[in-house]
Interface confidence: low
């Protein structure tokens, strides 16, 4: 006869593992028991369990409650044992052993291979602004045996960077990516992808990239010149920017007060019915966490009365 | 994005052969194995062939057992289901499933069923 | 090959409803135990393998445990999308078998 196994049996942390054991005999041929035991280099030889013929299975303490028979039914020539919920410290060389009659005794040998999963943590980098130079946008790191795989998935244009630790059982691997801060990266996704054996499928952790930034403010509403004459409604200018974090706007009136009546609704300037007291130098400020601009209109409300042309100067300044 | 699509389905007499197609994508498919699922109308799920990666063992139900035969073209990333000397119990909606790549490389244990295809209709009568 | 026995065969359920339907094998299968939700015209989905892992992407209101010869699949507070038919799946030996169904109807 002849002793089948597995020269690895390959698991997930937690899972249970089957170690093959099967006396394939000639016709007649019996076990009386078998011995498994695991039989790591340089360590003597720990007793696992025994399966007797008999007396049916023993399980040494050190593994009490972990190791049982594959279920029924069961064929007397097989040996196999189940090793419940693996973990990283039984990884190692099993041996089982068979006492067989009249053949006498076989061994063989298998190694256990205990995958651990990776639980995958992303750690964004500092602040990202509009301006920056090259720039950590965010790293990732797993830790796993074997070690596992660090990717990433995004639009978003960047240099990658990655480096391994190895522990005993197990090795850590951190990705870096790094990008330049621009404004079309504002809510774009940054994922990192961690890929591994004993993965049912690939984990993805998701950041979200906040980059700050503030656009040139502009103001509109003087398009129309002839519309800005006196007892005309409804007359506003707007002011134009945008940014993140999202700006606030505030006017005011380079040459005094802002009139009586004129109303101030974030980035829009109402004003009551014309007159020439509304002429004058309005500068919209915009400004965020980030940074501030200015844009400043000249409005020249014109009398009907008179023929003179209105001038309108626009003056961006930031 | 897995994708799995079933073809080759459509009506067939009794005593009669049809081969179903299995167009995998998004996936690498050599490392996957595969299975056939059948649905008759109104009634419920029946395994009916897989395929492993490891040494291509193929296993069948004891009801189709002889008459069908799996197989896989890894080249085309194509799953196969060659069905000869179809019967009337035949009839039903075939699935093609793939297996999640589990850990232990061994024939004796199958996998859940991760992906699934939209099923092509079997039907066999005179 | 391995039986597997659902209960019960349909339910009716309300929104909001905890819902439980048990799987028994006719002998022991570890944890090598699949769920999955089937709507009409459709080809099922996997929501919990290994007896008590919710498949990514499932929501959490679906939760399985058991191991050996006895599973539940539980929905903790039913949806209107999860009116469906449910069946679990023994892949510890070939062939792999499954648990005739059970609907769950609106009540």
């Known amino acids: 006869g002849e002793l089948e196994t597995s020269d690895v049996v390959t698991v997930v942390l937690g899972q249970d593992a089957k170690l093959p054991c099967f006396y394939r005999g000639d016709s007649g041929e019996q076990v009386g028991q078998v011995a498994w035991a695991r039989v790591d280099a340089g360590e003597g030889a720990q007793e696992l369990a025994l399966l007797h013929s008999k007396y049916g299975l023993h399980v040494s303490p050190a593994y009490e409650g972990r190791v049982e028979q594959p279920p029924p039914p069961r064929n007397p020539l097989d040996g196999s044992v189940l090793l419940r919920n693996a973990v990283q410290a039984d990884e190692g060389e099993y041996e089982c052993r068979v006492s067989t009659f009249p053949a006498g005794s076989f061994q063989a040998r298998l190694r256990l291979r205990v995958l651990v999963p990776p639980l995958p943590s992303l750690n964004p980098g500092p602040a990202l602004e509009e301006g920056q130079g090259l720039t950590l946008a965010a790293s990732c790191t797993a830790e796993g045996s074997p070690a596992p795989s660090v990717t990433w998935d995004t639009e978003v244009k960047g240099t990658t960077s990655s480096r391994s630790f190895k522990h005993s059982r197990s090795a850590a691997v951190t990705s870096e990516f790094h990008l330049v801060p621009s404004r079309s990266m504002n809510g774009q996704p940054l994922t990192c992808v961690v890929s591994h054996p004993g993965l049912l499928q690939d984990q993805r952790i998701t950041h979200i990239l906040h980059v700050s930034f503030l656009a040139e403010a502009s103001v509109r509403g003087l398009e129309d010149q002839n519309l800005w004459h006196i007892g005309r409604e409804g007359a506003m200018l707007k002011c134009l920017s945008e940014g993140q974090p999202p700006p606030s706007y505030n006017w005011t009136r380079l040459d005094g007060p802002l009139p009586s009546g004129v109303r101030v609704d974030g980035d829009t300037l109402g004003f009551p019915p014309l007159t020439t007291e509304h002429s004058g130098i309005y500068v919209c400020h915009v400004s965020n966490e980030f940074s501030s601009r200015d844009s400043q209109v000249t409005v020249d409300v014109l009398d009907p009365q008179e023929d003179s042309g209105k001038q309108v100067d626009l003056v961006s300044a930031s | 994005e897995v994708q799995l699509v079933e073809s080759g389905g459509g009506l067939v007499q009794p005593g009669g052969s049809l081969r179903l197609s299995c167009a995998a994508s998004?996936?690498?498919?050599?490392?996957?194995?595969m299975s056939w699922v059948r649905q008759a109308p109104g009634k419920g799920l029946e395994w009916v062939s897989g395929?492993?990666?490891?040494?291509?063992?193929?296993r069948y139900a004891d009801s189709v057992k002889g008459r069908f035969t799996i197989s896989r073209d890894n080249s085309k990333n194509t799953l196969y289901l060659q069905m000869n000397s179809l019967r009337a119990e035949d009839t039903a909606v075939y699935y093609c499933?793939?297996?999640?790549?589990?850990?232990?490389?061994?024939?004796?244990?199958?996998?859940?069923?991760?992906?699934w295809g939209q099923g092509t209709l079997v039907t066999v009568s005179s | 090959d391995i039986q597997m026995t659902q209960s019960p065969s349909s339910l009716s359920a309300s929104v909001g409803d905890r819902v439980t339907i048990t799987c028994r094998a006719s002998q022991g299968i570890s944890s090598y135990l699949a769920w999955y939700q089937q709507k009409p015209g459709k080809a099922p989905k996997l929501l919990i393998y290994a007896a008590s892992s919710l498949q990514s992407g499932v929501p959490s209101r679906f939760s399985g445990s058991g191991s050996g010869t006895d599973f539940t699949l539980t929905i903790s507070s039913l949806q209107p999308e999860d009116f469906a038919t449910y069946y679990c799946?023994?892949?510890?030996?070939?062939?792999?078998?499954f648990g005739q169904g059970t609907k769950v109807e609106i009540k």
């Open positions: 499933a793939r297996e999640y790549s589990d850990v232990v490389d061994y024939v004796s244990v199958r996998t859940p069923l991760d992906y």
């Open positions: 799946q023994q892949h510890y030996t070939t062939p792999p078998t």
């Open positions: 395929i492993k990666t490891y040494k291509s063992d193929a």
């Open positions: 998004g996936y690498s498919f050599t490392d996957y194995d």
